[in-house]
């Protein structure tokens, strides 16, 4: 699927538009909101009943080049004895992201976009139950 | 996309960091991945922290529809179906990566930007410190 | 480190009315919610209101609502409990709660006495 065009009746193409050549977009890689800090809670993913730890993923050719993924620590919950249940289970909690792709083929360099699922953290859920015949 | 020369052996050796501004296709990689929570798992309503889902729409940035989860409750489900209150409901937040229409409303000129979506819940236990 | 300074707690009649507030200072940032519990002696602390802080969604034990009512005050750090048609049930000592998701701090306490 391409990025939509602007289809809004109310939107009018601005004159000030940059001229792009056809099947492409110019993308600005320096990011708006960089510098946020982010005040995320302390050591949620170790006091969580279902917790998690993060691994780092590093690639040279993708935009970030470094991308946090989650792993849930068990199959069940820690209960409040602080012992597994696993009569429930620890599920992963997932987000889209956008990243640009560098591609090389040859003695050239061209850029995609790539959507990539990440994994934030983990939940604990009540299972659905089946009984098999 | 459009495409530059690279290293090495090639002219106009190109430097490893990424350029202010690339041309970029069109097309995105992996574009089908389902981008609607509520129907790639009823993990919102099963968990013991669930949360409910919002859809936060803005034409000026890719993707337009974004889904927010605000945790449903204070406190966390327990085995009889009550909310305990000596546990909390926390939003998992994550920073996500989206295209700004820059300048806005051009239809193919875009800029990245850094966004903080709830995307989820968690049940955690809280250390308790009684004040003095 | 937090503090948390408790008032407005005493002795009403049955119907009445009493304003509980806790003010909330320190290093008490990240707030999550901020609420009340309540014990009477030999019982457990139960829950009895709460306010999450990013957005004032309130939640409620089924025994106070429609007749407590929890607000707070961002600027100072402070919630409040307004508590109207009181009923000797409701006599406890009554816990400001501050949690900030992964620490939850607890204030002393305040004696309110509902009685004829």
């Known amino acids: 699927r391409k990025i939509p065009k602007v289809g809004h009746t109310f939107f009018q193409k601005p004159e000030s538009c940059p001229p792009v050549p056809g099947g492409s977009m110019k993308l600005d890689i320096g990011i708006i909101n960089e510098n946020q800090r982010v005040s995320m809670s302390r050591n949620i993913e170790s006091r969580s009943t279902s917790p998690w730890n993060y691994t780092v993923t590093w690639d040279p050719n993708r935009y970030p080049s470094e991308v946090v993924q989650a792993q849930c620590r068990n199959l069940g919950c820690i209960n409040a004895q602080g012992k597994e249940d696993i009569s429930m289970n620890s599920v992963p909690i997932q987000q889209e992201t956008l990243v640009v792709r560098r591609k090389h083929q040859g003695c050239s360099v061209s850029f995609q976009l790539e959507k990539v699922l990440v994994t934030v953290g983990c939940t604990c859920v009540t299972p659905v139950i089946h009984h098999v015949q | 996309g459009i495409t530059i020369p690279r290293n090495p052996g090639c002219p106009n050796s190109e430097d490893k960091n990424f350029p202010r501004t690339v041309m970029v296709n069109l097309n995105i990689h992996n574009r089908n991945t389902n981008t609607n929570p509520k129907r790639s798992s009823d993990y919102y309503n099963r968990s013991t922290s669930p949360w409910n889902l919002h859809r936060n729409e803005d034409p000026e940035r890719y993707p337009s529809v974004i889904w927010e989860a605000k945790c449903r409750h204070l406190g966390c489900i327990n085995a009889d179906g009550n909310v305990d209150y000596h546990m909390n409901s926390v939003p998992i937040q994550q920073e996500i990566l989206v295209l700004r229409r820059e300048p806005p409303h051009c239809p193919n000129s875009f800029r990245l930007e850094k966004i903080l979506v709830s995307v989820g819940c968690t049940c955690v236990t809280p250390i308790v410190h009684h004040v003095a | 480190e937090v503090q948390l300074v408790e008032s407005g707690g005493g002795s009403v009649q049955p119907g009445g009315s009493l304003r509980l507030s806790c003010a909330a200072s320190?290093?008490?940032?990240?707030?999550?919610?901020f609420g009340w519990f309540r014990q009477t002696p030999g019982k457990e602390r139960e829950f009895v209101a709460g306010i999450r802080w990013s957005d004032a969604y309130t939640e409620y034990a089924n025994s106070v609502k429609g007749r407590f009512t929890i607000s707070r005050d961002n600027s100072k750090n402070t919630v409040y409990l307004q508590m109207d048609s009181l009923r000797p049930e409701d006599t406890a000592v009554y816990y400001c709660?501050?949690?900030?998701?992964?620490?939850?701090?607890w204030g002393q306490g305040t004696l309110v006495t509902v009685s004829s």
């Open positions: 320190g290093r008490a940032n990240s707030i999550n919610w």
């Open positions: 709660v501050l949690d900030l998701s992964t620490v939850r701090y």
